[in-house]
Amino acid sequence: MKVLQEPTCVSDYMSISTCEWKMNGPTNCSTELRLLYQLVFLLSEAHTCIPENNGGAGCVCHLLMDDVVSADNYTLDLWAGQQLLWKGSFKPSEHVKPRAPGNLTVHTNVSDTLLLTWSNPYPPDNYLYNHLTYAVNIWSENDPADFRIYNVTYLEPSLRIAASTLKSGISYRARVRAWAQCYNTTWSEWSPSTKWHNSYREPFEQHHHHHHHHHHH
């Protein structure tokens, strides 16, 4: 039994690091393998992760961590019974994939404005809490070409857009993801999407001027 692709790990910089690797043949990861991990620090204990299968020869392990600081370094040992298959190390701060934002809500109670809000996936004591920026993806269920991304580069987890920038009378979906420049993270997964029906009515005068204005462009 040999490791074909060495473990690579990403951290959510809070409590979970996920390591994936491939073996040289079909493997029952949970019965045949163990990934031992230990923070390089005083008093730290070795922990054992029981991997799960991820395809025929692939394995994945979710390493649980109490907390994380920038300087953290973990030793990783992959065992098959008494045989050490691979030894390595992992610095969570150098391989961060943020948690996905949650609770995405579209507020349509203001007739001409859509307010999208979501929750920061980190608690205030986490460094990433104040360092996330977001991308909001809005698309039409009726028209695959009607697909847009809004970059939210401020800290507040919200986005305001004019309802008139979207087509009226059709359904849209939105989702949001996060990243942090400070640790050069990858993007998080997308949040679950939320759906709403976009309907707005402009007063006749405004409607008239709008088209007049549009004509000049």
Partner: antibody, heavy 116, light 112 residues
Framework: EVQLVQSGAEVKKPGATVKISCKAS????????MHWVKQAPGKGLEWMGR????????IYASKFQGKATITADTSSNTAYMELSSLRSEDTAVYHC?????????WGQGTLVTVSS | DIVMTQTPLSLSVTPGQPASISCRSS???????????LEWYLQKPGQSPQLLIY???NRFSGVPDRFSGSGSGTDFTLKISRVEAEDVGVYYC?????????FGQGTKLEIK
Amino acid sequence: EVQLVQSGAEVKKPGATVKISCKASGFNIKDTYMHWVKQAPGKGLEWMGRIDPTNGYTIYASKFQGKATITADTSSNTAYMELSSLRSEDTAVYHCVSRRPWFAYWGQGTLVTVSS
Amino acid sequence: DIVMTQTPLSLSVTPGQPASISCRSSQSIVHSNGNTYLEWYLQKPGQSPQLLIYKVTNRFSGVPDRFSGSGSGTDFTLKISRVEAEDVGVYYCFQGSHVPYTFGQGTKLEIK
């Protein structure tokens, strides 16, 4: 041996500022969060705030926001706390504590007395 | 802020007898990572506090096995199975799950 050695007792006048130090030995403060805890005479323990020494990220209990400023110098392996606009109610023993992820190591405490 | 309420505030125990201290949090102290950072500290007279129990039930290294922690949700207990003279001092519970972190008001244990 792991130790947190704090600077000595201070007597200050109301309105003054004091800066307490906490030097770590036996471990690198970059590997922990450094916290400060207040203990007024005859009273209990009060969490003040903490710093991640590597990136300087601090959080404070709202009561100590604007009163306490926590800093760290990783080159000297030392954490600091500055208390400003001192008043008589700031008279207390202040403990530095390393947390990873519990308070395993405490400094001996620094008594700050505010008196005119 | 989460308020940690300890009972009783003082306790007088005969050596060899058990002792129990309760700590109740004003709301859940389960961290968003799923762990409960409830700890117990003992401050002996003239000393800095020392860690006894972390994550509700785990004894810190060097802590005698007569100390045990239990509980979940908002109700937690520290038990000393047989009190010894060296156990005197003030016991504090602490929650490190939600900012601002908070201590209980302390329980003073004395020997009869």
